[in-house]
Amino acid sequence: DGCNDIFMKNEMLSASQPFAFNCTFPPITSGEVSVTWYKNSSKIPVSKIIQSRIHQDETWILFLPMEWGDSGVYQCVIKGRDSCHRIHVNLTVFEKQWCDTSVKGLPNLSDEYKQILHLGKDDSLTCHLHFPKSCILGPIKWYKDCNEITGERFTVLETRLLVSNVSAEDRGNYACQVILTHSGKQYEVLNGITVSITERAGYGGSVPKIIYPKNNSIEVQLGTTLIVDCNITDTKDNTNLRCWRVNNTLVDDYYNESKRIREGVETHASFREYNLYTVNITFLEVKMEDYGLPFMCHAGVSAAYIMLQLPAPDFR
């Protein structure tokens, strides 16, 4: 059929909860392409009707929710003007038993469900939630050994659980839970994460580099919306936390009530020698009180600020 088979991806998934997979393969999917999903070499594409339990949503395949019979190999076909590529995704559905103490281990979970905390350091766990824009995600709750996590050593920040001064007792089975809303219906997402510990520094104690901001000022009109990216390069194995703070407080906590200023979701691009991280700060509406205040981007021991200033008056 003239299509190039790119690769096979294996995913272990939990029954009875939503799952989505995005058909992206840069640079192939960055141009003008059409994406079509199929199951088990069927000639009939996956439905695009949003009421269907399994349907294609733009480049995504979305299961609302996943069921036992959904195991199998799915193909996403990427067609360009002069090209055709096919990605195979092998989905295996298992029954989740996060809280069943008789089950000693979880199945062979994918790497994002196995995470490592570094003893004696401030570290974080990430709740990996990969869903299309049509899915609205509620606040995340975190559990350890099936008990909701509380205590001042733990802070929930976007999709991350910050853990300060990691101890040996922090190892074990975690879960992050979120309510997903799609077309007015609600579904529970519960991701189990096995968390191990290490004393190894891993990243060789290197210092992350903040590319931007550079302790600079930004001219911005009162009342406008502003988004500023913090761009950071760091070693691949780093355990550094990246966040925005004001007055030495996480912006999400400082503006907890008004939510006028928020930290965005961290993204990263992987290069051969390092990762490039981006985490933004959004000012929904710039107010007078924001001017002259240093908004600090932190990455491990590194920090840099931006300061808002009113534009110079135009006397023309």
Partner: antibody, heavy 120, light 106 residues
């Protein structure tokens, strides 16, 4: 059950490069830390280095100028290369990994070891 | 580098004896790991995080210590315990082993 198996030549000539491969089954090398350790005859254990889940490598400074640890995720293997060997590099070489009771540094799983003799 | 010094280097003891092996670090370490090795075999994880026994390790073994001084104790020596024991730290690189303590039958 995690299993590790070392393979490579048992005899290497002085000044040449020692090359060993560790094949892993029952776990993915894209999780955890994958270590090389050696045991000199009649002497103790010496930590050589590791390659981590992300491909980051750490080498013992005493060997750093001569050692390279790499991996092939498609084959679930990781490898050790030690250049410019001398008789002092004659040892039993082990690959090992941790993760026991969620402790990455607890090296619970070991290969059976392979004796490498450096001799002309 | 953190130097790990085990004492004694070798020890002759009888079945039923209580035996203590000490590992001293040249700087503070957070946790100690102990391995048992028998001739011609790979080392086995014996004690981790200073005091936790690995799977299959008899309860007559115990580990303790903090800072720079750590011990492995066998309350009543059995024939299968005769082996070489190594301590190891992962607190500071390079990750060093002790020189080993060879436990022999008297």
């Amino acid at each position: 059950q995690v299993q590790l198996q070392e393979s490579g030549p048992g005899l290497v000539k002085p000044s040449q490069t020692l090359s060993l491969t560790c094949t892993v089954s029952g776990a993915s090398i894209t999780s955890g830390y994958w270590n090389w350790i050696r045991n000199h005859p009649g002497k103790g254990l010496e930590y050589i280095g590791y390659i981590s889940y992300s491909g980051y490598t750490y080498y013992n400074p005493s060997l750093k100028s001569r050692v390279t640890i790499s991996r092939d995720t498609s084959k679930n293997q990781f490898s050790l290369k030690l250049s410019s060997v001398t008789a002092a590099d004659t040892a039993v070489y082990y690959c090992a990994t941790g993760g026991y009771d969620y402790v990455e540094d607890a090296l619970y799983y070991w290969g059976q070891g392979t004796l490498v003799t450096v001799s002309s | 580098d953190i130097q790990m010094t085990q004492s004694p280097s070798s020890l002759s003891a009888s079945v039923g004896d209580r035996v203590t092996i000490t590992c001293r670090a040249s700087s503070n370490v957070r946790y100690m790991y102990w391995y048992q090795q028998k001739p011609g075999k790979a080392p086995k994880l014996w004690i981790y995080l200073t005091s936790n026994l690995a799977s299959g390790v008899p309860s007559r073994f115990s580990g303790s210590g903090s800072g720079t001084s750590y011990t492995l104790t066998i309350s009543s020596l059995q024939p299968e315990d005769f082996a070489t024991y190594y301590c190891q730290q992962f607190t500071t690189s390079p990750y060093t082993f002790g020189q080993g303590t060879k436990l022999e039958i008297k």
